[in-house]
């Protein structure tokens, strides 16, 4: 087994989201079962929770959780100070916003505490792994006879993330979606003052103070115009 | 709603001060770098001064004379400008990011990312 054991201080780089390491072992034995995969994810820079399948182990079993910040002021190791369980087994490790360091290399290492050997770190970039909390406050307003225009609130900061309209009428199969940039702003140009307009919002840390991949939850929906719902044949399909 | 909102510029002589203010709202200030950037006519986005992650960087062109501070309990960052020069006209942004951004990570910023920014004038 070509293995790399990490430490706080190692050199190790890797332009990957994480890196996966376990520990050499001697014989074949339940040291040589893999770890489950640790999925952190940061939720609007506020806290983070790091999250394994604890049901994927052959028996019920506390995992410990250890991090670090690689070449960082904060490279000394930390134990996890508030699991999270499933059915009474550690199943993950939430992180208060203070032990959150955005820009500095993640290490995460789970390890089995009846068989310290077995265990594995891997890295993680948080700026790529933050997911803002859902946007806020939407609203509507005539720029024109024809024109509506969009606007929403977001709790974090506005240049860091990009936007997701999606809309559609009563009487539309499918969502009709538009791209938005940081300034959390979106024209319709043609509105038709017969139809009933549906708008949501979802937003993404992307792409100026990280590259996450991941979007937040949609927004409360909003509406618009008439409400045409009783002539609509679509609409129980589309609420389904 | 996040907002930032700068006040302070105006018009000065040479060798004048003048201290700008920016109120944030809407997002954690204390867990955020805070900082200044300028725009001169015609020209590029130029950072002045940042802390970030306890430390403070200045453009080499304001060191000496521009000084960054913050009040967390007001939520307001301030740049004091002293011995100001006619290169210093420019309008200035206050800045906000994520706490580490400028010492860890960095990137080109566009000015308008953020507020409306403030007018300062220096002539000779």
């Known amino acids: 087994l070509n293995t790399t054991i990490l430490t706080p201080n190692g050199n190790e780089d890797t332009t990957a989201d994480f890196f996966l390491t376990t520990m050499p072992t001697d014989s074949l034995s339940v040291s040589t079962l893999p770890l489950p995969e640790v999925q952190c994810f940061v939720f609007n820079v506020e806290y983070m929770n790091c999250t394994w399948n604890s049901s994927s182990e052959p028996q019920p079993t506390n995992l410990t959780l250890h991090y670090w910040y690689k070449n960082s002021d904060n490279d000394k190791v930390q134990k996890c100070s508030h699991y999270l369980f499933s059915e009474e087994i550690t199943s993950g490790c939430q992180l208060q916003k203070k032990e959150i360091h955005l820009y500095q290399t993640f290490v995460v290492q789970l390890q089995d505490p009846r068989e310290p050997r077995r265990q594995a770190t891997q890295m993680l970039k948080l700026q790529n792994l933050v997911i803002p909390w859902a946007p806020e406050n939407l609203t509507l307003h005539k720029l024109s006879e024809s024109q509506l225009e969009l606007n929403w609130n977001n709790r974090f900061l506005n240049h860091c993330l990009e936007h997701l309209v999606q809309y559609r009428t009563d009487w539309d199969h499918s969502w009709t979606e538009q791209s938005v940039d940081y300034r959390h702003k979106f024209s319709l140009p043609s509105v038709d003052g017969q139809k009933r307009y549906t708008f949501r919002v979802r937003s993404r840390f992307n792409p100026l103070c990280g590259s996450a991949q991941h979007w937040s939850e949609w927004s409360h929906p909003i509406h618009w115009g008439s409400n045409t719902s009783k002539e609509n044949p679509f609409l129980f399909a589309l609420e389904a | 709603q996040v907002q930032l909102q700068e006040s302070g510029g105006g018009s000065v002589q040479a060798g004048g001060s003048l201290r700008l203010s920016c109120t944030a709202s809407g997002f954690t200030f204390d867990d955020s770098d805070m900082g200044w950037y300028r725009q001169a006519p015609g020209g590029e986005c130029e950072l002045v001064t940042i802390s970030s992650d306890g430390s403070t960087y200045y453009a080499d062109s304001v060191k000496g004379r521009f000084t960054i501070s913050q009040d967390n309990a007001k939520n307001t960052v301030y740049l004091q400008m002293n011995s100001l020069k006619p290169e210093d006209t420019a309008v200035y942004y206050c800045?906000?990011?994520?706490?580490?951004?400028?010492?860890?990570?960095?990137?080109?910023?566009?000015?308008?990312?953020w507020g409306q920014g403030t007018q300062v004038t220096v002539s000779s």
């Open positions: 800045a906000a990011e994520p706490r580490g951004y400028y010492s860890n990570y960095g990137g080109r910023r566009e000015c308008n990312y």
